[in-house]
Amino acid sequence: AITEAREEAKPYPLFPGPLPGSLQTDHTSLLSLPHTSGYQPALMFSPTQPGRPYTGNVAIPRVTSAGSKLLPPLAFKHTVGHIILSEHKDVKFNCSISVPNIYQDTTISWWKDGKELLGAHHAITQFYPDDEVTAIIASFSITSVQRSDNGSYICKMKINNEEIVSDPIYIEVQGLPHFTKQPESMNVTRNTAFNLTCQAVGPPEPVNIFWVQNSSRVNEQPEKSPSVLTVPGLTEMAVFSCEAHNDKGLTVSKGVQINIKAIPSPPTEVSIHNSTAHSILISWVPGFDGYSPFRNCSVQVKEVDPLSNGSVMIFNTSASPHMYQIKQLQALANYSIGVSCMNEIGWSAVSPWILASTTEGAPSVAPLNVTVFLNESRDNVDIRWMKPLTKRQAGELVGYRISHVWQSAGISKELLEEVGQNNSRAQISVQVHNATCTVRIAAVTKGGVGPFSDPVKIFIPAHGWVDHAPSSTPAPGNADPVLII
């Protein structure tokens, strides 16, 4: 027969197998055994139940010192097999054994789920000596039990290298359901199904799950834990939670917000960091991402000019860093710039447009009709050219840069001259005789140096060789000019 003592008068399934008894309690002793003064066990259990065969480990002692009779086998007395109690209650249980006095130094150890309990546990062993035997009661107490105290407890005793093991005492700590898996916040596509999971455990089991959406119950009848809720889709943000119910009451999970992915908000604070003649460096502050990571951004550039055709240039860039260098712009031009970014749902609106300007550019064409003369009497070279047809964007002409390279017998040196914008001729001193002088000219504005003209070569003979024929820039498509002597 299996005995039960319980907290509440309600049916509870008996535990099969090796559990000899069951007790559900939250308080006080059930019965007293003999005890030493000053020690009152808080919870004691029924001693041996007659008529039940014992299947645990026993030690069978050999012959006594008198050499006449065998001692009976040693075994722990039977005790309650199952204790059910609520979380945070105190519990005390024990095992007892009678040991013939011929044995010395008997020690009892407590084990839980196969591991010895050492250290800070409240275990007390009491000895009650008699003429022939000593009754030993080992008590184990736990204050304010927790779920982690659930398990199978046994006593072990070593005698003469033999190990005696008690029946297990199964402690079941019951409480409110405990979540092992709660729903997680998610960002989902509008009208697209997704799953939420909720799992909770007892004891006591079963644990039943209700789902709640925006304070309304989704399922009017519970599902057994674990539960997966397939949400058919949402059109607006919702908050979900799950309720876990068991016989002890209910526990509510955290509420999780399910957001609906949307297009991002437009970027803000588009600002100019640096302008050159042909590029503008901008940055922006990204808008709200719409619950979906940014993928990339688009920089839109319109030329602000009544004469322009109003076309928009689009430059695609990565979403991070929030910065982009717009290139291939015209010099000294005004532009309107906006930024839009996209996520998996789509493109944001364009940011507020900002105005930006490029600076003066360098000339885009070289001076024309470059001619070179050798003035032997003055030992210099005369250079003449025509002013290039520069565009307005290149800005004001500030002068010219003349490159002249002198080459003779393995020696080469380049010299640069700067001349003012009003000139269209220059003279340079002959640097080396019996050498070739190669001349190129570039126009200069505040925006920089333009391209150099095609090279014009003139041969500088040794003293006394005179040739007044000029070298000049060839017509387009001709080979490099050379001075024919």
Partner: antibody
């Protein structure tokens, strides 16, 4: 497949009692609530209430408290609706409907016409 | 309780036409369901949770809406669509149905 089969039509006199049954098959009966809906001639659908097939607890809409009673026989997967003290205005077709998540009536019985007439 | 108003009460359309019927709630609801009922048969589940077509429902049907305003649209009406369509809310008890929109085919 899932089916809800209702009992046949009933002709009753005012003051009498009628009991309509709804036998479910093809799913675990105690996993889903059972709602009752009626439609009076020329009118729309109206929800009477539902019964929790797991706990047996009924819930009634305000207009159907008192004379209406839901019950279960889980051993034969059957829900029943009993109407006491029948009145002429109880004449309607009564439907049982399995209630899924989000109060979606995914499966309906074929309907039982109750006629109350002197 | 949440009251659902369906409009129009009667909708007449020719085959091939696009039609839309609406269902308005007196307060915000989480989902709207739709059912089709033809004379002499029980209501058929038609659109679940605002926009999900029930099994066997033709793809020309669609549902949309949020908050207090929902609609059922048929992109190209066919003769077999003649029926009364009821909306039903999920959010709070009691469950309530709209008064129905009767679709007639010319």
């Amino acid at each position: 497949q899932i089916q809800l089969v209702q009992s046949g039509p009933e002709l009753k006199k005012p003051g009498e009692t009628v009991k309509i049954s709804c036998k479910a098959s093809g799913y675990t009966f105690t996993s889903y609530g059972m709602s009752w809906v009626h439609q009076a001639p020329g009118k729309g659908l109206k929800w009477l209430g539902w019964i929790n097939t797991y706990s047996g607890v009924p819930t009634y809409a305000d207009d159907f408290r008192g004379r209406f009673a839901f019950s279960l026989d889980t051993s034969v997967s059957t829900a029943s609706l009993e109407i006491n003290n029948l009145q002429n205005e109880d004449t309607a077709t009564y439907f049982c409907a399995r209630e899924d998540n989000w109060a979606w009536f995914a499966y309906w019985g074929q309907g039982t016409l109750v006629t109350v007439s002197t | 309780q949440i009251v659902l108003s369906q409009s129009p009460a009667i909708l007449s359309a020719s085959p091939g036409e696009k039609v839309t019927m609406t269902c308005r709630a007196t307060s915000s609801v989480g989902y709207m369901h739709w059912y089709q009922r033809k004379p002499g048969s029980s209501p058929k589940p038609w659109i679940y949770a605002t926009s999900n077509l029930a099994s066997g429902v033709p793809a020309r049907f669609s549902g949309s809406g949020s908050g207090t305003s929902y609609s059922l649209t048929i992109s190209r009406v066919e003769a077999e669509d003649a029926a009364t369509y009821y909306c039903q809310q999920w959010s709070s008890n009691p469950r309530t149905f709209g008064g129905g929109t009767k679709l007639e085919i010319k």
